[in-house]
């Protein structure tokens, strides 16, 4: 039989989100979602004014061992 559950967080990770590692935590809607539903920002030319997609904060974690990522709203919206 395989071993028990993996640790919920990596040794260097911040406090874990409530998500399992397969999901990411979206701070805009305050719940876990499939990570593919989060969009990471792409480099934009200087002076571009269109709003960027939401981004995510990546905890420092071992691959497969940490909590889900936390998606953050844009700095301008904080």
């Amino acid at each position: 039989m395989r071993r028990g559950p993996r640790s919920l967080r990596g040794r260097d990770a911040p406090a874990p989100t409530p998500c399992v590692p397969a999901e990411c935590f979206d701070l805009l809607v305050r719940h876990c979602v499939a990570c593919g539903l989060l969009r990471t920002p792409r480099p934009k030319p200087a002076g571009a004014s269109s709003p960027a997609p939401r981004t995510a904060l990546q905890p420092q974690e071992s691959v497969g061992a940490g909590a889900g990522e936390a998606a953050l709203p844009l700095p301008g919206l904080l």
């Epitope: 395989r2 397969a22 719940h31 499939a34 990570c35």
Partner: antibody, heavy 118, light 113 residues
Framework: EVKLVESGGGLVQPGGSLSLSCAAS????????MSWVRQPPGKALEWLGF??????????EYSASVKGRFTISRDKSQSIFYLQMNALRPEDSATYYC?????????WGQGTSVTVSS | DIVMSQSPSSLAVSVGEKVTMSCKSS????????????LAWYQQKPGQSPKLLIY???TRESGVPDRFTGSGSGTDFTLTISSVKAEDLAVYYC?????????FGGGTKLEIK
């Protein structure tokens, strides 16, 4: 020892209902999401949906093929969860597996067979 | 929905041979923030339930023999068995868990000559 045991399968008529159960033991049930996956005879696996853990308010996600007809829930003791299947169709005939979800579908039950036929 | 395509659908190899099977997704499964690919491989032996072999495309589940190796990124993934044993007779499925609904490939059936 991690154990997932499904029950409740059987023969049901088209349009009928059935409730499947999955009893979990041997791990911290509240850390996991719990999924249902089915497999028609001789065919591939199909993910049906999952229910998140207590920290996430037991929210659910479903595949389009069963949304509105199937409901996933957990009991208050958090060690059993359910798949309530309504408006069953012949194409719902399959072996139904429960599986725990963390980094992927980590642990699987042995499955329970559902046949929808008149 | 993300479509997962596996090839070949079946293959027969002799004990001790190396085998590779492919899984392709209709869109990238790589989340750029953490460089993880949301892809898993499962083994289903005849008459049994599936068993997790690989997650994050390349991380071997505890207890899985090291002859099983997952590789690839983005849309193209491979499961390699370095030296097949008779007990590896099974159907192997890939699955994405990047976007709902999670979807499985059609499977690759490994037969032993």
């Amino acid at each position: 020892e991690v154990k997932l045991v499904e029950s409740g399968g059987g023969l049901v008529q088209p349009g009928g209902s059935l409730s499947l159960s999955c009893a979990a033991s041997g791990f911290t049930f509240t850390d996991y999401y719990m999924s249902w996956v089915r497999q028609p005879p001789g065919k591939a696996l199909e993910w049906l949906g999952f229910i998140r853990n207590k920290a996430n308010g037991y929210t659910t996600e479903y595949s389009a093929s069963v949304k509105g007809r199937f409901t996933i829930s957990r009991d208050k003791s958090q060690s059993i969860f359910y798949l309530q299947m309504n408006a069953l169709r012949p194409e719902d005939s399959a072996t139904y597996y429960c599986a725990s979800l963390r980094s992927a579908l980590d642990y699987w039950g042995q499955g329970t067979s559902v046949t929808v036929s008149s | 929905d993300i479509v997962m395509s596996q090839s070949p659908s079946s293959l027969a190899v002799s004990v001790g041979e190396k085998v590779t099977m492919s899984c392709k997704s209709s869109q990238s499964l790589l989340y750029s923030n953490n460089q993880k690919n949301y892809l898993a491989w499962y083994q289903q032996k005849p008459g049994q339930s599936p068993k997790l072999l690989i997650y994050w495309a390349s991380t071997r589940e505890s207890g899985v023999p090291d002859r099983f190796t997952g590789s690839g990124s983005g849309t193209d993934f491979t499961l390699t068995i370095s030296s097949v044993k008779a007990e590896d007779l099974a159907v192997y499925y890939c699955q994405q868990y990047y976007i709902y609904p999670y979807t499985f490939g059609g499977g690759t059936k490994l037969e032993i000559k």
